[in-house]
Interface confidence: low
């Protein structure tokens, strides 16, 4: 029943063009190119895409035509290597072009930049956007794909097509509405926020595959799909995991045409076999392709089958545990993970993987012992502290969030994480801590049974952002250690870090704490970021400052900004009052 068994094709490019259709083919090639060459101007990419598309059409007409038998990596790599400014724009990345496939593609992948030096996207006036949309809809939408793809080089390409479809629908609907802005802006905000979340989730999948291997990704997928489809048989879940792993391996490897094609096949398979997978798929399967795939990926967990037997019978009490384990270790562990996960939609995926790891370690030890059964009889008791640790952490942090609200909760995390890893750059600490803080409003509203999967799996995504940003410029051994030792223990590793006693405080620099009248025109979010940046810098100067000291300085700072923004001569106020604030802060913190 393999979804991806295909006949060999004389021309891979023709095959994908026919499967995907011209519109999706062009969009996916544009995404692929923009994710590789993140600094190239839009017009250059469009030109390359048009050339590839024209070539693909010649291959559709005659699969035996010259070069049509070449692999997609060869065709796309050759095209990227024609860019004249490759050396001056990308430096050593140009050396990739001297390599042969598959090394050349691997080289391009290694040069993807998670934090490219690109200007922030500024949203034009609604009327300007609507005019641009009406003047040239095709270019307008291509530009959206290009701008997102180059800033998010691991964005899940078929999902970006879904975002682009919603983006187009928003403009088509709202540019004809009576109040264009009221219609459009909330939709664009929603797309932006969902897009950032989607990008971060996919980045974790790619990191899992690239840094920890296929086995780690498959384990994650077994746990998640077993929670989502608890009525499905183990063989069915295994088949879905195999196919899903292929899809994500392709997308993370830059094989976007194959990835989108295979994702469509997987959605088709799931919908054709929904009776043996989940009762929750009916609505998803009635939707058009892009919406269908998205809907399946987000579908709620099916109800657990009634009267599931105790796990202990097969995995602890049975005399055949070591025999079954020895015969096929990964299959047996996969079955354990499947059975545990389908019974525990209330656990995070990472917790389930920790339990499976503990079970595996116990069997490795006990199946070599004199009395294996006696040795592993109490293995489930070892799970208790592993389950309680995230439960307690979430309870404490949700209480703190409810007491402080999101902004102050973020500030508490900023202080906590700056003290743990003060070497990390201030923008990264601010970005990561703000995102960590969003776990409160995202997850604490849920009932107990949904809190842990929401919170801990979200934290895994956010901490992966820290890991990929830190990998680009490593500055902290502690971050490297937590990021590389174990994928599923990243969050407990960071939680366990205490204040870094080896850190030498940063020299005080008054310029860091000098503010100007431009802060008054910023949005509330941007103003918060300014204040949080100052807070991180304070902690870097005075890592031993108490909560009370920091709170007093931050309260003074907020009052200072409010006062000067109301002043007639704002700039003078910021200059004069700013000096007083810096002096008072230094005194308060003993700097």
């Amino acid at each position: 029943r393999g979804v991806f068994r295909r006949d060999a094709h004389k021309s891979e490019v023709a095959h994908r063009f026919k499967d995907l259709g011209e519109e999706n083919f062009k969009a996916l090639v544009l995404i692929a190119f923009a994710q590789y060459l993140q600094q190239c101007p839009f017009e250059d990419h469009v030109k390359l895409v048009n050339e590839v598309t024209e070539f693909a059409k010649t291959c559709v007409a005659d699969e035996s035509a010259e070069n049509c038998d070449k692999s997609l990596h060869t065709l796309f790599g050759d095209k990227l290597c024609t860019v004249a400014t490759l050396r001056e724009t990308y430096g050593e990345m140009a050396d990739c072009c001297a390599k042969q496939e598959p090394e050349r593609n691997e080289c391009f992948l290694q040069h993807k930049d998670d934090n490219p030096n690109l200007p922030r996207l500024v949203r034009p006036e609604v009327d300007v956007m609507c005019t641009a949309f009406h003047d040239n809809e095709e270019t307008f939408l291509k530009k959206y794909l290009y701008e997102i793809a180059r800033r998010h080089p691991y964005f899940y390409a078929p999902e970006l097509l879904f975002f682009a479809k919603r983006y187009k629908a928003a403009f088509t609907e709202c540019c004809q509405a009576a109040d264009k802005a009221a219609c459009l802006l909330p939709k664009l905000d929603e797309l932006r926020d969902e897009g950032k979340a989607s990008s971060a989730k996919q980045r974790l999948k790619c990191a899992s595959l690239q840094k920890f291997g296929e086995r780690a990704f498959k384990a994650w997928a077994v746990a998640r799909l077993s929670q989502r489809f608890p009525k499905a048989e183990f063989a069915e879940v295994s088949k879905l995991v195999t196919d899903l792993t292929k899809v994500h391996t392709e997308c993370c490897h830059g094989d976007l045409l194959e990835c989108a094609d295979d994702r469509a096949d997987l959605a088709k398979y799931i919908c054709e076999n929904q009776d043996s997978i989940s009762s929750k798929l009916k609505e998803c399967c009635e939707k058009p392709l892009l919406e269908k795939s998205h809907c399946i990926a987000e579908v709620e967990n099916d109800e657990m089958p009634a009267d599931l037997p105790s796990l202990a019978a097969d995995f602890v009490e049975s005399k055949d545990v070591c025999k079954n384990y020895a015969e096929a270790k990964d299959v047996f562990l996969g079955m354990f993970l499947y059975e545990y996960a389908r019974r525990h939609p209330d656990y995070s995926v990472v917790l389930l993987l920790r339990l499976a790891k503990t079970y595996e370690t116990t069997l490795e030890k006990c199946c070599a012992a004199a009395d294996p059964h006696e040795c592993y009889a109490k293995v489930f008791d070892e799970f208790k502290p592993l389950v309680e640790e995230p439960q307690n952490l979430i309870k404490q942090n949700c209480e703190l969030f409810e007491q402080l609200g999101e902004y102050k909760f973020q500030n508490a995390l900023l202080v906590r994480y700056t003290k743990k890893v003060p070497q990390v750059s201030t923008p990264t600490l601010v970005e990561v801590s703000r995102n960590l803080g969003k776990v409160g409003s995202k997850c604490c509203k849920h009932p107990e049974a949904k809190r842990m999967p929401c919170a801990e799996d979200y934290l895994s995504v956010v901490l992966n952002q820290l890991c990929v940003l830190h990998e680009k410029t490593p500055v902290s051994d502690r971050v490297t250690k937590c990021c590389t030792e174990s994928l599923v223990n990243r969050r407990p590793c960071f939680s366990a870090l205490e204040v870094d006693e080896t850190y030498v405080p940063k020299e005080f620099n008054a310029e860091t704490f000098t503010f100007h009248a431009d802060i008054c025109t910023l949005s509330e979010k941007e103003r918060q970021i300014k204040k949080q940046t100052a807070l991180v810098e304070l902690v870097k100067h005075k890592p031993k400052a108490t909560k009370e000291q920091l709170k007093a300085v931050m309260d003074d700072f907020a009052a200072f900004v409010e006062k000067c923004c109301k002043a007639d001569d704002k700039e003078t106020c910021f200059a004069e009052e700013g000096k007083k604030l810096v002096a008072a802060s230094q005194a308060a913190l003993g700097l």
């Epitope: 009406h134 088509t172 609907e173 509405a177 219609c183 009635e286 939707k287 058009p288």
Partner: nanobody
């Protein structure tokens, strides 16, 4: 410029029928799901029915199920709503919209059901 022009409304007795049309222009009609929305006097807009881009998938509000039928002709860029067994509570201005939105960008067509 996106344009949606509804027609076919009018005064009809309870139990009667009407067929509404919506002519679309200025966008790729065949690529979008479409909806009918209505607004009764003094009330907010109410979603009535939707159809996907190809015309295969149709959905209806409970209040009109079994009485109204939505359809489309992509070649003519036109959306239709066949309304049978009309009731006084169906009295409203009917609008067609892109997607399943209830935000209006057109004039609509008045349907009045009264004896």
């Amino acid at each position: 410029q996106v344009q949606l022009v509804e027609s076919g409304g009018g005064l009809v007795q309870p139990g009667g029928s009407l067929r509404l049309s919506c002519a679309a222009s200025g966008f790729t009609f065949g690529s979008f799901g479409m909806s009918w929305v209505r607004q009764a006097p003094g009330k907010g807009p109410e979603w009535v029915s939707a159809i996907d881009s190809g015309g295969a998938d149709t959905r209806y509000a409970e209040s009109v199920k079994g009485r109204f039928t939505i359809s489309r002709d992509n070649a003519k860029k036109t959306l239709y709503l066949q309304m049978n067994s009309l009731k006084p509570e169906d009295t409203a201005v009917y609008y067609c919209t892109i997607g399943q939105s209830t935000s209006r960008g057109s004039q609509g067509t008045q349907v009045t059901v009264s004896s």
